[in-house]
Amino acid sequence: HNTTVFQGVAGQSLQVSCPYDSMKHWGRRKAWCRQLGEKGPCQRVVSTHNLWLLSFLRRWNGSTAITDDTLGGTLTITLRNLQPHDAGLYQCQSLHGSEADTLRKVLVEVLADPLDHRDAGDLWFPGESESFEDAHVEHSISRSLLEGEIPFPPTS
């Protein structure tokens, strides 16, 4: 799996989409988990409705929501009021029994609001550190991360 980068602005909402084969994953619940670094385990944040037929209903855990379009084959995660600590690696997963298939690996980056002049502290400004070579990553736009790339607009 390549890693797809989604960037959002602090304080705003970020939508992450995970496309999948609706036939292959028919009848399976989905989940959104946070990876503890690239090498660490993936800890469940939120999962779709216990009844697969009701997967279209939005479920929340704190500021994170999940909804599944099972016919169209798109899992959507919404991170509301994005904060610096929301940045990191995540996975969209398809659940079957105690197993989980990875649908997409996601890197969430939180950018500083250029209009917010308060102490930026833990926030990142594009171009402040190592950045993609010859790449333009817009806020809330995703792109795939190639092996060896460090996707810094961020500084950490």
Partner: antibody, heavy 120, light 112 residues
Framework: QVQLQQSGAEVVKPGASVKMSCKTS????????ITWVKQRPGQGLVWIGD????????NFNERFKTKATLTVDTSSSTAYMHLSSLTSEDSAVYFC?????????????WGQGTLVTVSA | DVVMTQTPLSLPVSLGDQASISCRSS???????????LEWYLRKPGQSPKLLIY???NRFCGVPDRFSGSGSGTDFTLKISRVEAEDLGVYYC?????????FGGGTELEIK
């Protein structure tokens, strides 16, 4: 910018214990693994263990499992290492380090080191 | 534990020469996620170690392109194409794929 500031040098007696700190700044503390590394005078680097502040997950080198205790205080963005039952073998410089980025676990950011001297 | 064996122990070079350091692991160091977490660090006297190479061959930001990493399986190499005075110090390979993570014994790069 990312910074890791370690506590000052310690001189302790054999059998005693010591707790050193690694105060971080410039990034979301909960999001990155903190690693501890030992270097004795004239010797190589030894990986002690690491801790993930956001969940308290830890990995350890078995050699240090009864020697070192790793903890964090998220309110002050500080990692701690407690060393117990000190002997001359524990005289060393201890470093804390942080991984470079979510997609690069290499230790890119290091503290300046804490020198521990065990002496009667 | 994975044992990382570095050779040579000491490497005398003239400035401008190429230097090559070898690192051999006692078993393959491919993580369960498919990545090989082989890194190279330089420690100069009185300084903290500095990350040079990660995931076998990726240069960390700010590291000059005269440094290159290569290898696979159990055999890895760090090459410095033209040694400069600021490159002197002790080089360590490191595997971060299998706990406990382990460093090589170090190779001292010194002036001939």
């Amino acid at each position: 910018q990312v910074q890791l500031q370690q506590s000052g040098a310690e001189v302790v007696k054999p059998g005693a214990s010591v707790k050193m700190s690694c105060k971080t700044s410039g990034y979301p503390f909960s999001n990155f693994w903190i690693t501890w590394v030992k270097q004795r005078p004239g010797q190589g680097l030894v990986w002690i263990g690491d801790i993930y502040p956001g969940s308290d997950n830890r990995n350890f080198n078995e050699r240090f499992k009864t020697k070192a205790t790793l903890t964090v205080d998220t309110s002050s963005s500080t990692a701690y290492m407690h060393l117990s039952s000190l002997t001359s073998e524990d005289s060393a410089v201890y470093f804390c380090a942080r991984e470079a980025y979510y997609t690069n676990p290499g230790f890119a950011y290091w503290g300046q080191g804490t020198l521990v001297t065990v002496s009667a | 534990d994975v044992v990382m064996t570095q050779t040579p122990l000491s490497l005398p070079v003239s400035l401008g020469d190429q230097a090559s350091i070898s690192c051999r692991s006692s078993q393959t160091i491919i993580h369960s996620n498919g990545n090989t977490y082989l890194e190279w660090y330089l420690r100069k006297p009185g300084q903290s170690p500095k990350l040079l190479i990660y995931k076998v061959s990726n240069r960390f930001c700010g590291v000059p392109d005269r440094f290159s990493g290569s290898g696979s399986g159990t055999d890895f190499t760090l090459k410095i194409s033209r040694v400069e005075a600021e490159d002197l110090g002790v080089y360590y390979c490191f595997q971060g794929s299998h706990v406990p993570y382990t460093f090589g014994g170090g190779t001292e790069l010194e002036i001939k």
